[in-house]
């Protein structure tokens, strides 16, 4: 192998790996042909000048999870052929100026999870070839103007989880290659008009978990090729009516855990590839007519956790491939018995944790395909009769902790659930709150002669005899049915997977402890 | 008649853990939510927690999210407060309060007589 | 949300007319009840919903309003009214308090 330090492993394939906190200074001598190099968790505390000149055949240099604070300017002098240079996960305060200077292959650059306080455009001059540029995990309070004025071949660039408290709008002003920007997790207010005008082949802008309160009407005007764009837990209060109207590509939008109040109609469009879109943990009060009607493609919308007390009879136009709706944990008193008139594909609805206390009986009347409904923790004491009867495919349905009313016109209820007990599953079956004789008694087996009658009598006798099973054989008890979108908030898929934070919280679409142990 | 009895408070250093429990009797436990509500020395009223009748739905206020978990044994007629990464400003005369009814609402008909949660090292 | 109650503090005399107010900082129906709490005692509901008295509470007590702006009235103050008087939002998560309102006796 040409000689192999003790330190490391040489493997045929011209790899090297040193790794150890015996480590102290970069091991010698290393093997001429080596064309990749990994230091891995050792003690080194400093680079000296060309430790690696008699390497120059290396393309991929590792330098992670070390002691490293400080690099002498010509530590990387003769590797004219590096493609790959890590530096991440070190204690690196500085960068010298020139340092990457002759590296004129480089084509990945990470400096993640240091403690960079600053980049100036001398820095990265040098580099023109660089596609990837990694500064996330720093300490970085701003950007100079020029920074990145050199890497016109940049395609993603990364500035998440810094001190960033403004960006200067001409920062990214050469960058017309970029795909991927993230800006998440920085100090931002607002960013200026113009920021990202010379992005045109953008396909990623990652700006969540910032103090962002106000969007220019034109941010992201010139960025056709958007297809993911994460706005999530910023301080967003309101929507400019064109802030989203030329990003025909965007298949994913986060805007969860802001303050908006309100959403205007057409707001989000036109958008035919979007197929998620999550608004939870807002201020919504109200849904307006025709609120989503741009979106023709969306499957699952996400509403839960806002304070919606009214949604008007057309909110939900368009939606014709929606397959899951979240209501859960607002403020629903009544629902208007056409709001879901436009639903045929929805499968699962949550309006559990609302105030509901009645519903009409044409509310899932168009919507033949629901398969789970959770109305659990609202305020019903009744349901009109034959309101499930036509859901064939109805294996989930949530009536529990709801004040019901156990007398005489209870019982077409209590009939239809006797026959369609594994619907209910076995964890909580609805108990009578009233009156207060059969109070904690199962609705499903309650004696009604002892309940007090009803001052008027139902005209039709109960619902029909025979249960509507679903065509599978067997039915969840604690499971849910719904997909595995209910039990997480989207993750935003990133390529380097420390910026990678799933939330696996089960309330945001619906799951509660009694469905999801 | 209705009664509710809290006990497990005490002194506890910062960072410390302590669980309360409310032993609930005269009613029909596992059709009401129930709530706790404290009230630091000299201070307003304080909404900590509510808990529906099954169990199925728990709510938080935020300074609690993550530290304090409430549940309730429906069998034992017993709600509780687990507390856990207790910090100074947490001292208060804690309540356990029954609802007026089994979806959770923040009409509190009963309150039990309170105990004190004091957290200083 | 924000309660916030006015006054923070009143003096009157049994026999007078009382009306506290509870502002809230955004719409919220009429999700709202009012609590009388004395010193050393837990509190006690006296009004649900804005508007719906208690049962077992005395008619003096009368609350209403809706949306951002709510009332609690004693029509006639009697010497068992003389407390700290709470409102309680329970429309969004987190449930808020206002601050009080303490009634003493005007010397």
């Known amino acids: 192998y040409h000689g192999c330090p003790s330190e490391c492993t040489c493997s045929r394939a011209s790899q090297v790996e040193c790794t150890g906190a015996r480590i102290v200074a970069v091991p010698t001598p290393l093997p001429w042909n080596a064309m990749s190099l990994q230091i891995l968790n050792t003690h080194i505390t400093e680079l000296n000048e060309s430790p690696f000149l008699n390497i120059s055949a290396l393309i991929a240099l590792r330098i992670e999870k070390n002691e490293l604070s400080r690099i002498t300017p010509g530590a990387f002098r003769n590797l004219g052929s590096l493609r790959y240079l890590s530096l991440a996960n070190n204690k690196l305060q500085v960068l010298p100026i020139g340092l990457f200077q002759g590296l004129d292959s480089l084509e990945s650059l990470l400096l993640s999870s240091n403690q960079l306080l600053q980049i100036q455009p001398a820095h990265f001059s040098q580099c023109s070839n660089l596609k990837e540029l990694q500064l996330h995990g720093n300490h970085l309070e701003y950007i100079p103007d020029g920074a990145f004025d050199h890497l016109v071949g940049l395609t993603k660039l990364n500035l998440g989880k810094n001190s960033l408290t403004h960006i200067s709008p001409r920062v990214f002003q050469h960058l017309g290659n970029l795909q991927v920007l993230r800006l998440y997790e920085n100090r931002l207010t607002d960013i200026p008009m113009g920021t990202f005008d010379g992005l045109v082949n953008l396909q990623e802008l990652a700006l969540q978990q910032n103090q962002i309160g106000l969007l220019s009407p034109g941010l992201f005007h010139n960025n056709h090729n958007l297809q993911r764009l994460y706005l999530s837990n910023n301080h967003i209060s309101q929507l400019p009516p064109s802030v989203f109207m030329q990003l025909p590509q965007l298949n994913r939008l986060t805007l969860f855990g802001n303050s908006l109040k309100e959403l205007s109609p057409g707001i989000f469009g036109p958008m035919p590839n979007l197929r998620e879109l999550w608004l939870y943990d807002n201020h919504i009060s109200s849904l307006p007519d025709n609120v989503f009607s741009n979106l023709r493609q969306l499957q699952v919308l996400i509403l839960s956790r806002n304070q919606i007390s009214f949604i008007s009879p057309g909110a939900f136009n368009g939606l014709t491939e929606l397959r899951e709706l979240s209501l859960h944990t607002n403020a629903l008193q009544d629902l208007d018995g056409n709001v879901f008139r436009m639903l045929a594909n929805l499968q699962n609805i949550s309006l559990q944790n609302n105030r509901l206390r009645q519903l009409p009986g044409n509310i899932f009347a168009n919507v033949n395909g629901l398969m789970a409904i959770q109305l659990q923790n609202n305020q019903l004491e009744n349901l009109p009769l034959g309101i499930f009867d036509h859901l064939g495919k109805l294996c989930e349905l949530r009536l529990y902790d709801n004040p019901w009313r156990c007398d005489s016109d209870i019982l077409p209820l209590r009939n239809w659930l006797l026959l369609n007990q594994p619907r209910l599953g076995t964890d909580t079956v609805p108990v009578c709150f009233s009156p207060a004789n059969v109070r904690g008694q199962s609705l499903i087996i309650i004696n009604v002669n002892v309940a007090v009658p009803s001052v008027h009598v139902p005209e039709v006798p109960s619902y029909p005899e025979t249960p509507w099973y679903p065509d599978t054989p067997s039915y969840p008890d604690t499971t849910s049915v719904s997909s595995t979108t209910e039990l997480t908030s989207p993750v935003e898929d990133y390529t380097d997977l420390t910026t990678i934070q799933v939330t696996d919280d089960r309330s945001v679409w619906g799951m509660t402890q009694a469905q999801s142990g | 008649q209705v009664q509710l009895l809290e006990s497990g408070g005490g002194l506890v250093q910062p960072g410390g853990s302590l669980r309360l429990s409310c032993a609930a009797s005269?009613?029909?436990?596992?059709?009401?939510?129930m709530s706790w509500v404290r009230q630091a020395p000299g201070k307003g009223l304080d909404w900590v927690s509510v808990?529906?009748?099954?169990?199925?739905?728990?709510f938080y206020t935020d300074s609690v999210k993550g530290r304090f978990t409430i549940s309730r044994d429906n069998s034992e007629n017993t709600l509780y407060l687990e507390m856990n990464s207790l910090r100074a400003e947490d001292t208060a005369v804690y309540f356990c309060?029954?609802?007026?009814?089994?979806?959770?609402?923040?009409?509190?008909?009963?309150w039990g007589q309170g105990t004190l949660v004091t957290v200083s090292s | 949300i924000v309660l916030t109650q006015s006054p923070s503090s009143l003096s009157a005399s049994v026999g007078d007319r009382v009306t506290i107010t509870c502002r809230t900082s955004q719409v919220i129906r009429n999700d709202l009840g009012w609590y009388q709490q004395k010193p050393g005692k837990a509190p006690k509901l006296l009004i649900y919903?804005?508007?719906s008295l208690q049962s077992g509470v005395p008619s003096r007590f009368s609350g209403s309003g809706s949306g951002t702006d709510f009332t609690l009235t004693i029509s006639s103050l009697q010497p068992e009214d003389f407390a700290t008087y709470y409102c309680l939002q329970d429309n969004n998560y987190p449930w808020t308090f206002g601050q009080g309102t303490k009634v003493a006796i005007k010397r």
């Open positions: 919903d804005a508007s």
């Open positions: 005269g009613f029909t436990f596992s059709t009401f939510a």
């Open positions: 808990i529906s009748g099954t169990g199925g739905s728990t």
């Open positions: 309060a029954k609802a007026v009814t089994v979806n959770t609402r923040g009409f509190f008909d009963y």
